[in-house]
């Protein structure tokens, strides 16, 4: 079978303060079983940006309908961008575990940076 790939097509995303940013992530397989989460940064200090299962992320919405069957689009939108939002964002596939899920594969990351303000 096809091995799962995590596709984040944009290496760099220039955003404007106050606007909404869309971070794209698609997967090539439904397997292995387990969730996709979004993080900013890498390593133990990385920040969880979105987990559909738990947590409260009022500025984050999903691009795809949460009731869509066999979805492979895990893109998100972040509203009301501020300078504190800059950084590199990763979508990460976890393999279902019991009791803990295990990180399986990460996308290559999308760097979010501030672009020039529109004149």
């Amino acid at each position: 079978e096809e091995e799962l790939q995590m596709i984040q097509p944009e290496k760099l995303l220039l955003v404007t303060v106050g606007k909404t940013a869309t971070l794209h992530c698609t997967v090539t397989s439904l397997l292995p079983v387990g969730p996709v989460l979004w993080f900013r940064g890498v390593g133990p200090g990385r920040e969880l940006i979105y987990n559909q299962k738990e947590g409260h992320f009022p500025r984050v919405t999903t691009v795809s309908d949460l009731t869509k069957r066999n979805n492979m689009d895990f893109s998100i939108r972040i509203s009301s961008i501020t300078p504190a939002d800059v950084g590199t964002y990763y979508c990460v596939k976890f393999r279902k575990g019991s009791p803990e899920n295990v990180e399986f594969k990460s996308g290559p990351g999308t760097e979010m940076a501030l672009g020039a303000k529109p004149s």
């Epitope: 397997l31 009731t67 066999n70």
Partner: antibody, heavy 120, light 108 residues
Framework: EVQLLESGGGVVQPGGSLRLSCAAS????????MTWVRQAPGEGLEWVST??????YYADSVKGRFTISRDNSKNTLYLQMNSLRAEDTAVYYC???????????????WGLGTLVTVSS | EIVLTQSPATLSVSPGERATLSCRAS??????LAWYQQKPGQAPRLLIY???IRETGIPARFSGSGSGTEFTLTISSLQSEDFAVYYC??????????FGGGTKVEIK
């Protein structure tokens, strides 16, 4: 049309073994997780085991005794059942998993089931 | 393990009447709940997923509602072919996937 056809059930003595098969057709078998669910006579549904690609999951009641596997080249799901007990007597259904977006799995297609009877 | 409790165990309804089936979860499962119908000697059939989404081909008289810990399956006007056992299943937190004990809808 999705079809799932179980086979391999029968009567076996306590402590014995059986291997169930589920032949799948009508969908891209290798792309989906697959599950075994059982139903004891006159009782409700009980999840047994699920397999993704290499990832496998078991109910506590069968862990260490049952092994789920798949052969994607044959579009076939298997359940190897060892050290069988009287309480394993049930109709065993194979089911295709379907995932809701960012969430978990439910079962959108089921086979007709195969009866396993464990009795001396 | 999340426990699903279905009530009532048996529901006696006349054809054409409304049937309301309940499924209560021991903890929050958000909308990660499915409903199945099973007739004697047959395999279960998916009716509803994501608590409220009707599976393709399922008649509009079947509807699901609720979220969190309280869920309802409603059959607006029972037809003869609807007399069966109905199970709920949660997929929020697994393993294990868990099913309710079932509600038998019988002819009054």
């Amino acid at each position: 049309e999705v079809q799932l056809l179980e086979s391999g059930g029968g009567v076996v003595q306590p402590g014995g073994s059986l291997r169930l098969s589920c032949a799948a057709s009508g969908f891209s078998f290798s792309n989906f997780a697959m599950t075994w669910v059982r139903q004891a006579p006159g009782e409700g549904l009980e999840w047994v085991s699920t397999i993704g690609s290499g990832d496998t999951y078991y109910a506590d009641s069968v862990k260490g005794r049952f092994t789920i596997s798949r052969d994607n080249s044959k579009n076939t799901l298997y359940l190897q059942m060892n050290s069988l007990r009287a309480e394993d007597t049930a109709v065993y259904y194979c089911a295709k998993d379907s995932t809701v977006s960012w969430s978990g799995d439910f079962f959108d297609y089921w086979g007709l089931g195969t009866l396993v009877t464990v009795s001396s | 393990e999340i426990v699903l409790t279905q009530s009532p165990a048996t529901l006696s309804v006349s054809p054409g009447e409304r049937a309301t089936l309940s499924c209560r979860a021991s903890q929050n499962v958000k909308n990660d709940l499915a409903w199945y119908q099973q007739k004697p000697g047959q395999a279960p059939r998916l009716l509803i997923y994501a608590a409220r989404i009707r599976e393709t081909g399922i008649p509009a008289r079947f509807s699901g509602s609720g979220s969190g810990t309280e869920f309802t399956l409603t059959i607006s006007s029972l037809q003869s072919e609807d007399f069966a056992v109905y199970y709920c299943q949660q997929y929020y937190d697994w393993p294990p996937f868990t099913f309710g004990g079932g509600t038998k809808v019988e002819i009054k």
